[in-house]
């Protein structure tokens, strides 16, 4: 029914994650995760971050690891929320009410997000060579990333 996930794994907390290589807009990726019985993944601190990093490092995707890949995650800055340059997530937030770890214990930003308080913005996880997590990158929600991460 579904093309199988490129990689999947679970964390010590019992949550499971899947990584999919598919060129998609953010909305289509989020819908894909829901249709699979999950949701677009948060990548908070601690066990969750470790589980997702392990998925990425399990091997290169299409292209054999020759280029940086962008994966949709459940990170966005809502309209009317401002860029906060001194916050670890820069004013972005995870689309989940699950309790998370310390936001200070997160990946770095590959590029600083544009300063804005008006437009909704999404963010991707950039992986160098498709396997080594470089950090977060702001991305317009209607653009296509190389893949997405789901959480179950």
């Amino acid at each position: 029914e579904h093309p199988t996930a490129d990689r999947a794994g679970c964390s010590a907390s019992g949550a499971c994650y899947s990584l999919h290589h598919a060129t998609m807009k953010r909305q289509a990726a989020e819908e894909a995760c829901i249709l699979r019985g999950g949701a677009l993944s948060t990548v908070r601190a601690g066990a969750e971050l470790r589980a997702v990093l392990a998925l990425l490092r399990a091997g290169p995707g299409p292209g054999g690891g020759s280029k940086d890949l962008l994966f949709w995650v459940a990170l966005e800055r809502r309209r009317s929320h401002c860029t906060l340059e001194n916050e670890p997530l820069r004013g972005f937030s995870w689309l989940s009410s699950d309790p998370g770890g310390l936001e200070s214990d997160t990946l770095q930003w590959v590029e600083e997000p544009q300063r804005s308080c008006t437009a909704r913005r999404c963010a991707v996880l950039q992986a160098t060579g498709g396997v080594e997590p470089a950090g977060w990158k702001e991305m317009r929600c209607h653009l296509r990333a190389n893949g997405y991460l789901c959480k179950y």
């Epitope: 579904h2 093309p3 598919a22 289509a28 829901i34 249709l35 019985g37």
Partner: antibody, heavy 117, light 108 residues
């Protein structure tokens, strides 16, 4: 303007199969999931499944697995649904529908294809 | 799957009357993924209210939506003749997407 144009009314015998179409225009067909919904006469709405034309990924309501098959042809921006082993329970109006701009609500619908078994 | 129960199944209201119908989910649904559709006989459903409280394009301001968790409602502040229709709630928080059985609103 976004439009979903569905094929016409179908009359079919029990046990037969039917294939209906939904031609999309006014948006990038390969970028959005296309959903199918069933409505029996005088009844409510049931989600059948969805297809992502960009890579032919599909998802089905468990109830319709083995009954419905979803496909898409990107060159013509057309989605198809085939229903097999028809019974009286399959007599209904079938809608193709997709999200385009409001949080995952189905905000564009075809006019419906009526199937009578 | 998440079951959505709408009540009442059928209701009638006089012109100018305030109308409220409810949608109860069998388990919690994010307000972002709870929507309402209006359908009239012989027509396709139309998105009416999305994400619990946002009116779709062209929907009169007399309509409103509210709720959270397992309890949602659609309200018409002052019934008009064109509001006679069947209204369906719909969730997309969990797959499969599900719809309520509908509330048929008639003019008294």
């Amino acid at each position: 303007e976004v439009q979903l144009q569905q094929s016409g009314t179908v009359l079919a015998r029990p046990g037969a199969s039917v294939k209906m179409s939904c031609k999309a225009s006014g948006y990038t067909f390969t970028s959005y999931w296309m959903h199918w919904v069933k409505q029996r006469p005088g009844q409510g709405l049931e989600w059948i499944g969805a297809i992502y034309p960009g890579n032919s990924d599909t998802s089905y309501n468990q109830k319709f697995k083995g009954k419905a098959k979803l496909t898409a042809v990107t060159s013509t921006s057309t989605a198809y649904m085939e229903l097999s082993s028809l019974t009286n329970e399959d007599s209904a109006v079938f809608y193709c529908t997709h999200y385009y701009g409001s949080d995952y609500a189905m905000d564009y619908w075809g006019q419906g294809t009526s199937v009578t078994v | 799957q998440i079951v959505l129960t709408q009540s009442p199944a059928i209701m009638s209201a006089s012109l100018g009357e305030r109308v409220t119908m409810t949608c109860t989910a069998s388990s919690s649904v994010s307000s972002s993924y709870l929507h309402w559709y209006q359908q009239k006989p012989g027509s396709s459903p139309k998105l009416w209210i999305y994400s619990t409280s946002n009116l779709a394009s062209g929907v009169p301001a007399r309509f409103s939506g509210s709720g959270s968790g397992t309890s949602y409602s659609l309200t018409i502040s002052s019934m008009e003749a064109e509001d006679a229709a069947t209204y369906y709630c719909h969730q997309y928080h969990r797959s499969p997407r599900t719809f309520g059985g509908g509330t048929k609103l008639e003019i008294k």
